[in-house]
């Protein structure tokens, strides 16, 4: 498997419609919680919680502040922490508690605290519970949490120094935690937690399970340096701890190694960055997508592996355990345990079989089972990815977060669309296409290239968005920018399962699964653009330039996978001559303009898709070069800003089916005024201008017209 290619399209922040939310002097918007039924997005930031309209996050509905007192700040600073940054209250837990309240925890100047937020009044109840074990002390420390039936399961550090890791359940009747022992947790960096509900039709009275994902220092591999290992661990929701052994400790805590590697190249991805659990009506068992980087990542490598949850469950239910053995100089080595395994199976949830044997609760489990799981929390078998290889490996990028959406293309094929954020504020959208990865697009979510700290996907049909949180704010982006593809070819070549070309409206439209009639829409996930209707017209942009100047003709080909070439009249231009130059690989520069340069210029693009090359005419320009005797006083000119040039004449364009959108204005770099020529007729056409173009000093003038294209294939 090769490295993933560059994104086909790069959308700059200003090019697409992104909705933003940020409040002055508020930072670290890292906790996001979506209430789909209320269309509300809850945002936990530093010292504040906000409620915003999930359909338009710039609309703030409520806000509440949870600041640290000066006294607490001072005490924190005395312990050597920064008063300006660390000794504040970073919201780290934002979980639903009931229909009317949220459970919120913050670092609270290194004295973690939790409270209940009433959603009606949007005020804290002032419970000020101790957040130890639920929320980290240090805002820089890792954490994860999930609320399951009113009980908070969390993975974080339990002390000021962050040296005691803990996976715990905060419960009034049965609080549980991990053993503070290296075999259980060895300097973990917590990434994600989620509950997997038992299957409703499960015959064996199974229990719900809570899964934790983290990276920790390996106990089983000993090298000169510390080897990091990605882990999946799970506990049973019904666990009540042991009666004597493992009292108030998990009796069901088991962990296994997650494998994500490229065997052919020896590339091992062993640092877990994020996890997303994909649940879909078509999936019997959830699939989880995990995002990794290698431990020594000097080249910026990232990988995504996908796993069937059943594979992990198989390891925990039937896999071999590891055990530690002491070798010379009291050195501990972990090896596969091949001895007898007590019954009931250590670490197993209480199911019908256990109940039939009179083990109705973990409190009834025999000491042998409990002692075994206490000493053998690590499985020898590893959890391997689907197809035994990564779904995606990308070079020169550090991915930070992942969300995945399962969607159906027009032909019924199901695609898992991966939305992966980067440490430079961008979002990549990728799919697997015929055993290769296609990165549909890259969107610059944050203008100042800051890391994306959290990603959230809305699952409501119709209005679908991705929400991204960073240090400076939250950005809301649609799942696709279909409308930005101006031609049928562009729409098809995007190979975006969310988009299809609508011939009646000559637009690229978003496919919403709820809207049924898709008749007549064109979508070819193979990228075969020959299915597109022939273009009968193409718009020409006309320009008048001063003799001796320089012209830049725009070619607005957005695809990073396309190459362009230019034609003048019937000849193909090479931009390596003294006469021509290429600007940004796409735009044509024509130097030292003379009358001989007047005529029709076309920019054609070629894009290879699966050993097929798609050619299309992207831009057409009619250039008229005039010798200017003297300046002319110009009437008032309507001026608009256009991307790519500072000023341009305003031109009204009637769009034609399948035609390229008019390219942005071409700006003359020569100085001097321009006289209006007498009704120019562009080469090869009798089409005359229908509008009068005003002229202004320092600017060439232009207009748009339509010419029949005789040789489109």
């Amino acid at each position: 498997m090769a490295f993933a290619p560059i994104p086909r399209i790069t959308w700059e922040h200003r090019e697409v419609h992104l909705v933003q939310f940020h409040e002055p002097d508020i930072y670290n918007y890292s906790a996001l919680l979506l209430s789909e039924d209320k269309d509300t997005l809850y945002i936990g930031a530093r010292e504040a919680v906000f409620a915003v309209n999930a359909l338009n996050i710039s609309e703030k509905q409520h806000e509440v502040y949870w600041k640290v007192s000066e006294d607490k700040k001072a005490k924190c600073a005395e312990k050597g922490k920064s008063k300006q940054t660390e000794c504040l209250n970073y919201i780290r837990v934002l979980q639903p508690l009931s229909a009317t309240s949220l459970y919120v925890c913050g670092t609270n100047a290194f004295q973690p605290a939790c409270d209940h937020l009433n959603l009606t009044s949007f005020k804290f109840l002032g419970k000020n519970e101790d957040g130890k074990g639920r929320c980290p002390f240090d805002p820089a420390h890792s954490y994860t949490s999930v609320m399951v039936d009113g009980e908070l399961y969390s993975g974080t550090s339990y002390n000021f120094l962050g040296s005691e890791p803990i996976i715990s359940r905060n419960s009034s009747h049965s609080p549980l935690r991990t053993e503070y022992a290296i075999p259980w947790l060895n300097e973990p960096s917590f990434v994600f937690a989620d509950v997997i509900r038992k299957s409703p039709d499960s015959p064996d009275g199974e229990d719900d399970r809570v899964y934790f994902f983290f990276t920790e220092v390996s106990v089983e591999y000993e090298f000169v340096f510390r080897v990091l290992i990605p882990r999946i661990a799970r506990v049973c929701k019904g666990d009540q701890g042991g009666l004597r052994t493992l009292q108030k400790k998990w009796t069901s805590f088991l962990k296994a190694r997650l494998i994500c590697s490229r065997p052919d190249s020896g590339l091992v991805f062993n640092v877990l960055r994020d996890v997303f659990v994909l649940r879909s009506p078509g999936l019997k068992v959830p699939v989880f997508y995990a995002l990794f980087t290698p431990q020594l990542n000097n080249v910026g490598l990232s990988a995504v592996c996908a796993y069937n949850l059943s594979t992990a469950e198989e390891v925990f239910s039937h896999g071999k355990y590891m055990q530690s053995t002491t070798v010379e100089q009291s050195h501990t080595k972990w090896v596969r345990y091949n001895g007898p395994v007590p019954k009931p199976r250590p670490g197993a949830c209480i199911d019908s079989e256990a109940r039939a044997a009179n083990y109705t609760s973990s409190l009834n489990l025999p000491d042998k089972t409990l002692q075994f799981v206490k000493d053998h929390p690590l499985m020898d078998d590893s959890v391997t990815p689907i197809d035994n290889r990564p779904r995606l490996i990308k070079k020169d990028v550090n991915y930070t977060q992942i969300v995945v959406d399962r969607t159906q293309a027009l032909d019924g094929t199901v695609y898992d669309v991966m939305f992966v954020s980067t440490d430079r504020g961008a979002l990549h959208k990728a799919i697997s296409l015929e055993h290769a990865v296609h990165i549909i697009e890259e969107t610059q979510l944050f203008q100042d290239f800051e890391p994306v700290q959290t990603l959230l996907l809305s699952s409501k049909k119709g209005n679908r968005f991705v929400y991204a949180g960073s240090n400076s704010g939250v950005v809301q982006a649609p799942l696709a920018f279909c409308g930005k593809h101006g031609t049928c070819e562009d729409c098809v070549l995007a190979r975006d399962p969310y988009c299809a070309w609508s011939p009646p409206t000559a637009t690229c439209v978003a496919l919403h699964q709820t809207e049924s009639p898709s008749r007549g829409l064109i979508q070819e996930m193979s990228g075969d653009a020959s299915v597109c209707p022939d273009k009968s017209k193409g718009s020409y942009r006309q320009h008048f330039f001063k003799h001796g100047g320089t012209a830049e003709l725009k070619c607005s080909q957005k695809s990073n996978l396309a190459r362009v070439f230019w034609k003048f009249q019937n000849g193909v231009l090479k931009a390596e001559s003294p006469k021509y130059g290429l600007m940004g690989r796409k735009n044509l520069l024509i130097f030292n303009l003379s009358e001989g340069d007047s005529g029709v210029y076309q920019c054609l693009s070629e894009e290879r898709v699966k050993n097929k090359t798609v050619f299309q005419v992207v831009a057409k320009h009619v250039l008229e070069v005039k010798v200017v005797p003297k300046p002319v006083v110009a009437p008032t000119l309507s001026v608009v800003q256009t991307e790519g040039s500072r000023i341009a004449t305003k031109v009204l364009v009637a769009s034609t089916q399948g035609s390229s959108p008019p390219t942005p204005a071409v700006q003359a770099t020569s100085s001097g005024a321009i006289t209006l020529p007498p009704k120019p007729a562009p080469t090869g056409t009798s089409c005359e201008p229908k509008i009068v173009i005003n002229t202004v000093p320092q600017l060439h003038s232009e207009k748009t017209m339509y010419l029949k294209s005789s040789d489109n294939r």
Partner: antibody, heavy 119, light 111 residues
Framework: EVQLQQSGPVLVKPGASVKISCKAS????????MNWVKQSHGKSLEWIGD????????SYNQKFKGKATLTVDRSSSTAYMEFRSLTSEDSAVYYC????????????WGQGTSVTVSS | DIVLTQSPASLAVSLGQRATISCRAS??????????MHWYQQKPGQPPKLLIY???NLESGVPARFSGSGSETDFTLNIHTVEEEDAATYFC?????????FGGGTKVEIK
């Protein structure tokens, strides 16, 4: 001045593999595809495939799929072609040639690398 | 694959005379008015050299006595007044689809 400098001639045994290099200079390496072309003694030219150095995308002639592997090292502006499981049929001169677009043709060629497969 | 058939296979021309080489494609190599056919010259022990690109465009540094024409499936390379140094094998090549293919070559000898 644009130059494509290929590695020297090689003599290999049947079943072995060979890796030919093509070092580009005088232009921006990532702006042009690199093509590889085979010319058997006294015969015409056969296109093996090409690679886009910008993103590593490759396209192969079906006839050479599984036989040839094209790679690039952007840091040294060098393109490589590895030929595996060599037989006497693979004895030929192999050229690298750049192209800036399908409309431009292959405007600069390496001097060629002679590969002889013999036991 | 697109098959390119060159004719004649060899050609003997007198100095100063005109030489015409034909190349026929098994399917059209033209799109949007662009004809994706190129011509190369190869001398013994040397790599091919690009003469004409996109059917009729003279490559920089190539003498003006070389010209190309044609569209769709039929293309021609002309050497208007043959010189001694033009003795070589000439190949046509299409780039409208993969695999790129070459003609069988035409050997030009000077009489």
């Amino acid at each position: 001045e644009v130059q494509l400098q290929q590695s020297g001639p090689v003599l290999v045994k049947p079943g072995a593999s060979v890796k030919i290099s093509c070092k580009a200079s005088g232009y921006t390496f990532t702006d042009y595809y690199m093509n590889w072309v085979k010319q058997s003694h006294g015969k015409s030219l056969e296109w093996i495939g090409d690679i886009n150095p910008d993103n590593g995308f490759t396209s192969y002639n079906q006839k050479f799929k599984g036989k040839a592997t094209l790679t690039v090292d952007r840091s040294s502006s060098t393109a490589y072609m590895e030929f595996r499981s060599l037989t006497s049929e693979d004895s030929a001169v192999y050229y690298c040639a750049r192209d800036g677009s399908s409309a431009y043709g292959m405007d600069y060629w390496g001097q060629g690398t002679s590969v002889t497969v013999s036991s | 694959d697109i098959v390119l058939t060159q004719s004649p296979a060899s050609l003997a021309v007198s100095l100063g005379q005109r030489a015409t080489i034909s190349c026929r494609a098994s399917e059209s190599v033209s799109i949007h008015g662009t004809h994706l056919m190129h011509w190369y010259q190869q001398k013994p022990g040397q790599p091919p050299k690009l003469l004409i690109y996109a059917a009729s465009n003279l490559e920089s540094g190539v003498p003006a006595r070389f010209s190309g024409s044609g569209s769709e499936t039929d293309f021609t390379l002309n050497i208007h007044t043959v010189e001694e140094e033009d003795a070589a094998t000439y190949f046509c090549q299409q780039s409208i689809e993969e695999p790129r293919t070459f003609g069988g070559g035409t050997k030009v000898e000077i009489k």
